[in-house]
């Protein structure tokens, strides 16, 4: 039994069969910049007089405005089948989330099962190393953090175009530099199953002591 079935309470509607959205695809996994289409559908028997339009929601918030959705109606002698189509062109990471449909039937709100949309792409930096001025031969730290999906994201550190660590570290990564005698440029490489993203290069300057 589908838990989304409405609990009708009025005397006239007690005999109405339960209505619920059909089960969804479940989980869509795709790469950034691809197009995606999905739908939810519901069969409304003729015995139901009052139905409102289908609205699309993502992560608990209604999707309004520029989103591309179409609702199709297929009537037959028993009622009407309604299919709500949703499409996203050139998906971005911000399109990640749980999508679902809502509609009102006989003044009762019905919610579909979610469709999980997982957009995968190259690692995305949320923390990159920053330029600092350091005292000669004094230890300092640099931080690099990148995320997927897909996870995990592995980090290589680069100093003056040469890799510092032979084995990658899982993001987030902190590089402890024991000290420098001259200016150097540091960056980090973030790797996941989709490929490689390189951070900005940062100059670490040696403070001149007067």
């Amino acid at each position: 039994a589908h838990t989304a079935a409405p609990q009708v309470t009025s005397t006239a509607s007690k005999l109405l069969p339960p209505v619920a959205f059909n089960h969804t695809i479940g989980h869509i996994v795709l790469s950034e910049h691809k197009n995606v289409k999905f739908n939810c559908s519901i069969n409304i028997p003729n015995t139901y007089q009052e139905t409102a339009g289908i609205s699309w929601w993502k992560d608990g918030k209604e999707l309004l405005g520029a989103h591309h959705s179409i609702t199709q109606f297929y009537p037959d002698e028993e009622g009407v089948s309604i299919i709500a189509l949703f499409s996203i062109a050139s998906v971005q990471r911000s399109d990640n989330g749980s999508y679902f449909c809502k509609m009102k039937v006989n003044n009762r709100e019905i919610v579909s099962d979610p469709i999980y949309v997982e957009v995968q792409g190259l690692p995305y930096f949320i923390k990159q190393p920053e330029s600092v001025n350091v005292t000669r031969n004094t230890a300092f730290n640099l931080t690099c953090q990148a995320v997927g999906p897909p996870e995990p994201v592995n980090i290589f550190w680069v100093q003056n175009s040469s890799r510092v660590n032979e084995k990658p570290e899982r993001s987030p990564s902190v590089l402890t530099v024991p000290g420098l005698t001259e200016t150097a440029v540091f960056s980090c490489e973030a790797h996941n199953d989709k490929g490689l993203t390189v951070s900005k290069g940062v100059h670490i300057n040696i403070k001149v002591i007067p």
Epitope: H23, T24, H27, D59
Partner: antibody
Framework: QSVEESGGRLVTPGTPLTVTCTVS????????MGWVRQAPGKGLEYIGF?????NTYYASWAKGRFTISKTSTTVDLKITSPTTEDTATYFC?????????????WGPGTLVTVSL | DVVMTQTPASVEAAVGGTVTIKCQAS??????LAWYQQKPGQRPKLLIY???NLASGVPSRFAGSGSGTQFTLTISDLECADAATYYC????????????FGGGTEVVVK
């Protein structure tokens, strides 16, 4: 990214126990977390899930027996009134997304023993 | 809650061989199914999600298929390191139907 459970110990039946999961390298405001247990020599058993905004979902058998809550870096599983059947290794695991209950990072588990 | 039924409970195969594990859901779960590998004394490891997507670092010898109520995990070119117990798990609308695991399948490699 890592998760680690703590707080497993020997308790007597009926004594509430809280097991804690500490996470690092990711944010609980982005990812959901699940709890799964495994009795000695048995299979995996799903207990429940807390999503990124704090909504909790439980397996039917677990409702009322367990409570899941979280802070910014920890997720707690409270066993409200343990019985000997609750003796198991308890795992916490990171969900694939905010509301997605497949688990891509698991802790090593913590053993809870309920005995007189 | 959805109930997941996994078969067989145990299977034995030779190195280089192929093993097929089946998982049946008590109702349609779309493709919201994951497979895990667990070795004795270790934590489970995600192998496959969304029924057929390989998790990071998992060799392509592992393959998942199916949708709706019937799912399959196939391990080809078996290696000794594949000896483990394998579990399926639904995460379809986990807020409504739970995240039940199958009973597990022990794979013995000869």
């Amino acid at each position: 990214q890592s998760v680690e459970e703590s707080g497993g110990r020997l308790v007597t039946p009926g004594t509430p126990l809280t097991v804690t999961c500490t996470v690092s390298g990711f944010s609980l405001s982005v990812y959901g977390m699940g709890w799964v247990r495994q009795a000695p020599g048995k299979g995996l058993e799903y207990i429940g899930f807390i999503n990124n905004v704090g909504n909790t979902y439980y397996a039917s058998w677990a409702k009322g027996r367990f409570t899941i809550s979280k802070t910014s870096t920890t997720v707690d599983l409270k066993i409200t009134s343990p019985t000997t059947e609750d003796t198991a290794t308890y795992f916490c695991a990171k969900g694939g997304g905010g509301d997605w209950g497949y688990f891509n990072i698991w802790g090593p588990g913590t053993l809870v023993t309920v005995s007189l | 809650d959805v109930v997941m039924t996994q078969t067989p409970a145990s299977v034995e195969a030779a190195v280089g061989g192929t093993v097929t594990i089946k998982c049946q859901a008590s109702q349609s779960i779309g493709n919201a199914l994951a497979w895990y590998q667990q070795k004795p004394g270790q934590r489970p490891k995600l192998l496959i999600y969304a029924a057929s997507n390989l998790a990071s670092g998992v060799p392509s010898r592992f393959a998942g298929s199916g949708s709706g109520t019937q799912f399959t995990l196939t391990i080809s070119d078996l290696e000794c390191a594949d000896a483990a117990t394998y579990y399926c798990q639904t995460y379809y609308a986990i807020n409504r139907y739970g995240g039940a695991f199958g009973g597990g399948t022990e794979v013995v490699v000869k």
